[in-house]
Interface confidence: low
């Protein structure tokens, strides 16, 4: 879009005559009609394709035309066009005589034409005026002309539209060549795209104004780079939204089941070694000198009957001391100075010579033991308690102290694992020899029926435009993570496109 400007400077009609040769009465009250059109090798009649303009009466016969542009007048004459300037043109300037005040074509006498000039040629857009003078037999017209671009139009052909704006359709000013120059914080072809907070995640974050970072569903954090785990997730993390990936030692749908009681609770005391043996279940292996489920009980060192051959044990601060009976010596009274001749075997034990009488061995009757049959048999030495139960001598009998989850004389029976209702989501529990088994209802799986399997809200591919679908397990619904340029619960709506500009 631009304007062809024509500045009329001087018109000479010394004899004051019309084109027909007839004189004007009393003089030629002259006005001009201008026709601007496309280039024609021979300027011929037809539409003034680039526009027409008429002047008022500017003078009589011969006169100079004042430059009225400063006063808002009509010289230079303006012929606006709203297309790409082609660089060539045809121009027709007619001088007419107006006998009265009505300058409309149909109101003029048929022979009111004074003169007509027609020129054609090339004309580039620019600020400089081209001066021209056309002379006919009776008249002379001096004028100048140029083509300039309208406001907001740029380029060699005034074809580049650029109007600064700061609204929904763009945020820019115009460079001298008509190219857009985005305002700070904006980018894109039409400067419509805000530049988000530095570091804002490309897919998971977006912004509607500069230096902002708004998170898409399922994401959080200043830069929208932290996923939101499943609602209720206790000891777990996520790599995509609504996940609950359990930390080590935790299990279950919400990672709230403790699979590493040893690490999380350190139940074993006095330096014992802890072994996990199931959910909230563990075994402590005690260091010498300690006993109890959690090795919390300190044993007297003499409780293990370290003194042999009837030696008596005395606890000391730094350990114990064996007082040996006659005929025996050594740390544990293990060395004998006796032979069968000394009747060393007690409780009816039979003595057998060894090493040519230098040594002996006692064969003990039932229920007695020891190198001299001096000890009643400890019913716990055969470790009769199953499943890690602790054996305790109680006078003539023995008893087993069972670990949690076991019962029976020898801790051989499982307390029903099912008593705790371990099966989630209505699963049916079955006790087995070495644990339990859950039979899960439709839609659930896993050792404890903790995994949902039936309802996958994403199975039907509800998200459009290549969005990522996430199943929200807490509500059996889906969430669509839209790619850039789309919005809506299913990413079905494109964000508003820039308007089509004419270039």
């Amino acid at each position: 879009s631009g304007v062809f400007q024509l500045q009329l400077q001087e018109f000479i009609n010394e004899r004051g005559v019309l084109a027909s040769g007839r004189p004007c009465e009393p003089g030629c009250r002259t006005f001009f009609r201008v026709c601007l059109k496309h280039f024609q090798a021979v300027v011929s009649p037809g539409p003034c394709t680039f526009g027409t303009v008429s002047t008022p009466v500017l003078g009589t016969n011969s006169f100079a035309v004042r430059d009225d542009s400063s006063g808002g007048g009509r010289n230079p004459l303006q012929l606006p066009f709203n297309f790409t300037w082609p660089g060539t043109f045809s121009l027709i300037i007619e001088a007419w005589h107006a006998p009265g005040d009505d300058l409309r074509p149909e109101a003029l006498p048929p022979d009111a034409l004074i003169s007509k000039i027609a020129i054609q040629g090339s004309l580039a857009v620019g600020q400089n005026w081209l001066l021209d003078e056309q002379t006919s037999t009776l008249t002379r017209l001096r004028y100048s002309y140029r083509v300039i671009c309208s406001d907001n139009y740029y380029g060699d052909n005034c074809s580049r539209l650029c109007k600064k704006r700061n609204d929904h359709f763009g945020h820019y000013v115009c460079q001298p060549d008509g190219n857009l120059s985005c305002l700070p914080g904006w980018t894109g072809e039409y400067c419509q795209q805000p530049i988000c907070l530095s570091g804002c995640h490309e897919q998971n974050g977006y912004c509607s104004k500069p230096a902002e970072c708004l998170c898409r569903p399922g994401w959080q954090g200043r830069l929208c780079n932290e996923c939101i785990p499943h609602n209720g997730c206790r000891h777990g993390t996520c790599s995509t939204p609504w996940q609950c990936t359990c930390d080590e030692g935790w299990g279950g749908l919400f990672c709230d089941q403790d699979l590493n009681y040893c690490t999380h609770h350190s139940p074993c005391k006095n330096g014992a070694t802890c072994s996990n043996s199931g959910q909230r279940s563990y075994t402590c292996t005690c260091r010498p000198g300690y006993t109890g489920v959690d090795c919390e009980l300190e044993l007297s060192e003499c409780d293990s009957n370290p003194c042999r051959n009837g030696g008596s044990c005395k606890d000391q601060e730094d350990g114990y001391h064996c007082l040996c009976p006659p005929g025996y010596y050594g740390l544990h009274c293990e060395h004998s100075t006796l032979s069968c001749a000394d009747s060393p075997c007690f409780n009816g034990g039979s003595c057998r010579e060894r090493n040519q009488g230098a040594n002996y061995a006692c064969e003990c009757p039932p229920n007695f033991t020891g190198s001299n049959c001096e000890k009643k048999v400890d019913r716990c030495t055969s470790n009769p308690c199953a499943n890690g139960g602790q054996c305790l001598n109680r006078g003539p009998s023995r008893m087993c102290r069972c670990r949690p989850g076991f019962t029976g004389t020898y801790c051989e029976l499982h307390v029903s694992d099912c008593a705790r209702n371990p099966c989630a989501h209505g699963g049916t529990c079955h006790d087995l020899e070495n644990g339990l088994m859950c039979t899960c209802p439709a839609g659930f799986s896993g050792r404890r029926c903790e995994v949902r399997t039936s309802i996958d809200a994403c199975a039907s591919s509800p998200c459009f435009n290549r969005a990522t679908c996430y199943t929200d397990l807490s509500t059996d619904t889906f969430v669509c993570n839209c790619p850039y340029g789309f919005v809506g619960s299913r990413c079905e709506f494109p964000v508003g496109l820039p308007p089509s500009f004419p270039w």
């Epitope: 027909s20 009609r33 011929s44 539409p47 149909e106 009111a112």
Partner: antibody
């Protein structure tokens, strides 16, 4: 007043030519142009072309380009339209009309010339 | 070529009624270059409106024109007996200059 008077009706055989005249009066002939328009029986108006009386430049509609010639004679202020190789579908009333250089509507019109093409 | 389509083809009205005639162009026409003509039976056309809305000399003010772009309208506010005729629109902005096919206004 401004007036255009056309020549009388013509009957022609297919393949012949016809030349219709249009005599102008009441205005300076050379500062305007003449357009030619035809109207077949019961039909609408069809523009054929124009000629400038100022410099004899002419522009013809595509349909008639090969068969029509328009001329003017400023000494008699008369415009002419010649149509060659006549066919039966050229049967029509042919009108001349004045148009201004800047303002291209047609005013006034001649009274029309009926050309009948028949074997 | 710009095609002008006039509607309706025929308009049956009584004297004193208002007539609205439409002319639609196949592409945009500058309003500077649209005219309306009236043709009585057996007569040459007569210029009514030029420049889409300017009345020609001697045309009564019951005739008015309006429109721009591709849609133009000729309105006769109160029909007189002499207004029953065929009306043509014409564009003279793009060569070839073309006419609409005409609207006949007849007495009901």
């Amino acid at each position: 007043q401004v007036q255009l008077v056309q020549s009388g009706a013509e009957v022609k055989k297919p393949g012949a030519s016809v030349k219709v005249s249009c005599k102008a009066s009441g205005y300076t002939f050379s500062t305007y142009g003449i357009s030619w328009v035809r109207q077949a029986p019961g039909q609408g108006l069809e523009w054929m072309g124009w000629i400038s009386a100022y410099d004899n430049n002419a522009d013809y509609a595509q349909n008639f380009q090969a068969r029509v010639t328009m001329t003017t004679d400023t000494s008699t202020t008369t415009a002419y339209m010649e149509l060659r190789s006549l066919r039966s579908d050229d049967t029509a009333v042919y009108y001349c009309a004045r148009y201004s250089w800047n303002f291209h509507w047609f005013d006034p019109w001649g009274q029309g010339t009926l050309v009948t093409v028949s074997s | 070529e710009i095609v002008l389509t006039q509607s309706p083809g025929t308009l049956s009205l009584s004297p004193g009624e208002r007539a609205t005639l439409s002319c639609r162009a196949s592409q945009s026409v500058s309003s500077t270059y649209l005219a309306w003509y009236q043709q009585q039976p057996g007569q040459a056309p007569r210029l009514l409106i030029y420049g889409a809305s300017s009345r020609a000399t001697g045309i009564p003010d019951r005739f008015s024109g309006s429109g721009s772009g591709t849609d133009f309208t000729l309105t006769i506010s109160r029909l007189e007996p002499e207004d029953f005729a065929v009306y043509y629109c014409q564009q003279y902005g793009n060569s070839p200059w073309t006419f609409g096919q005409g609207t006949k206004v007849e007495i009901k």
